[in-house]
Amino acid sequence: FKVATPYSLYVCPEGQNVTLTCRLLGPVDKGHDVTFYKTWYRSSRGEVQTCSERRPIRNLTFQDLHLHHGGHQAANTSHDLAQRHGLESASDHHGNFSITMRNLTLLDSGLYCCLVVEIRHHHSEHRVHGAMELQVQTGKDAPSNCVVYPSSSQDSENITAA
């Protein structure tokens, strides 16, 4: 399976909410021995491999923001902790999963990564990730609402086996 990032860049004004999105593509094993671990974290550019560094989002680690379920099931993060930080991650039945960030500030600008780990019990695990950039802007050059820029077809499907 692959992870697609429909948008590679989100440009938002301060104070706005944004939902960053990834999509699980390809054949997904829905067997009882397979579960999916999905999460989000921040990273930085200029590494040998994008998304290799895992940094927290608003002080929440990738463990705090994870979703754990089978196949294309819907799920949400534990509300209390995330919502206190203005965050919510969610997943639907169609392989889409997202993180919503409320009341953006300039400090939220940066590179965001979604991670999917397919865990086969008693077997190996398969990891893929997607990357996207969030630019929070203020002043005259801010947009009135979030503007999203599609990934090039080459960029939109990141395959990174662990």
């Epitope: 301060e14 005259k140 050059d141 503007v147």
Partner: antibody
């Protein structure tokens, strides 16, 4: 249906003042970022001023040539935006359009109001 | 400020012809927007964010480009397309091109 309608233009002498008004409907006005755009044969289309929503502290921005002479304001209770134009110059002559900004472009435009600055 | 230069200033086209209007920026911009202004009316957005067709705009219109060079293409010109076309960018400071006037032969 989104509607934007300007009024208040007319003939004014150099150095004079007037207040342009814009009434909007068909969208949540209090959330909108509203702009004025000027059009003249000499300058073409030129952005003039912007006022942002209450969530953005009604921040205002101006093109350099009108800074200190023009003032943009809004009344969310009346879904209206205003442009107070003072110390008018002949080069301010033209049509003034009220627009609503979406992202980085002007999504909706009024029919415009003509301002003529002449002795 | 970023200066947008449109060419040609005036263009004449036959019905059914495919035409391309261009807009060149003095510095690289992330996006370009295009407006159509028919005689005696206000501008109307045609294309936003370089490629996106505004609501109600026929699919004969399309936009493309990146960096400093952008274009608007009309795949099959119709009589109702006679108008002035303006490009627009909003970097740290919004500017418009001088326009291309399209005349129908």
């Amino acid at each position: 249906e989104v509607k934007v309608e300007e009024s208040g233009g007319g003939l004014v002498q150099p150095g004079g003042s007037m207040k342009l008004s814009c009434a909007a409907s068909g969208f949540t006005f209090s959330d909108a970022w509203m702009d004025w755009v000027h059009q003249s044969p000499e300058k073409g289309l030129e952005w003039v001023a912007e006022i942002r929503s209450k969530a953005n502290n009604h921040a205002t921005y101006y093109v350099e040539s009108v800074e200190g002479r023009f003032t943009i304001s809004r009344d969310d209770s009346k879904s209206s935006v205003f442009l107070q134009v003072n110390s008018l110059r002949p080069e301010d002559t033209g049509i003034y359009y009220c627009t609503r900004r979406d992202g980085y472009y002007f999504a909706y435009w009024g029919q415009g109001t003509l301002v003529t600055v002449s002795a | 400020d970023i200066v947008l230069t449109q060419s040609p200033a005036i263009m004449s086209a036959s019905l059914g012809e495919e035409i391309t209007l261009t807009c060149s920026a003095s510095s690289s911009v992330r996006d370009m927007h295009w407006y159509q202004q028919k005689s005696g009316t206000s501008p109307k957005v045609l294309i936003y964010n370089t490629f996106n067709l505004a609501s109600g705009v026929p699919s004969r219109f399309s936009g493309s480009g990146s960096g400093t060079f952008y274009s608007l293409t009309i795949s099959s010109v119709e009589a109702g397309d006679a108008a002035a076309y303006y490009c627009h960018q909003w970097s740290s400071y919004p500017t418009f091109g001088g326009g291309t006037k399209l005349e129908i032969k």
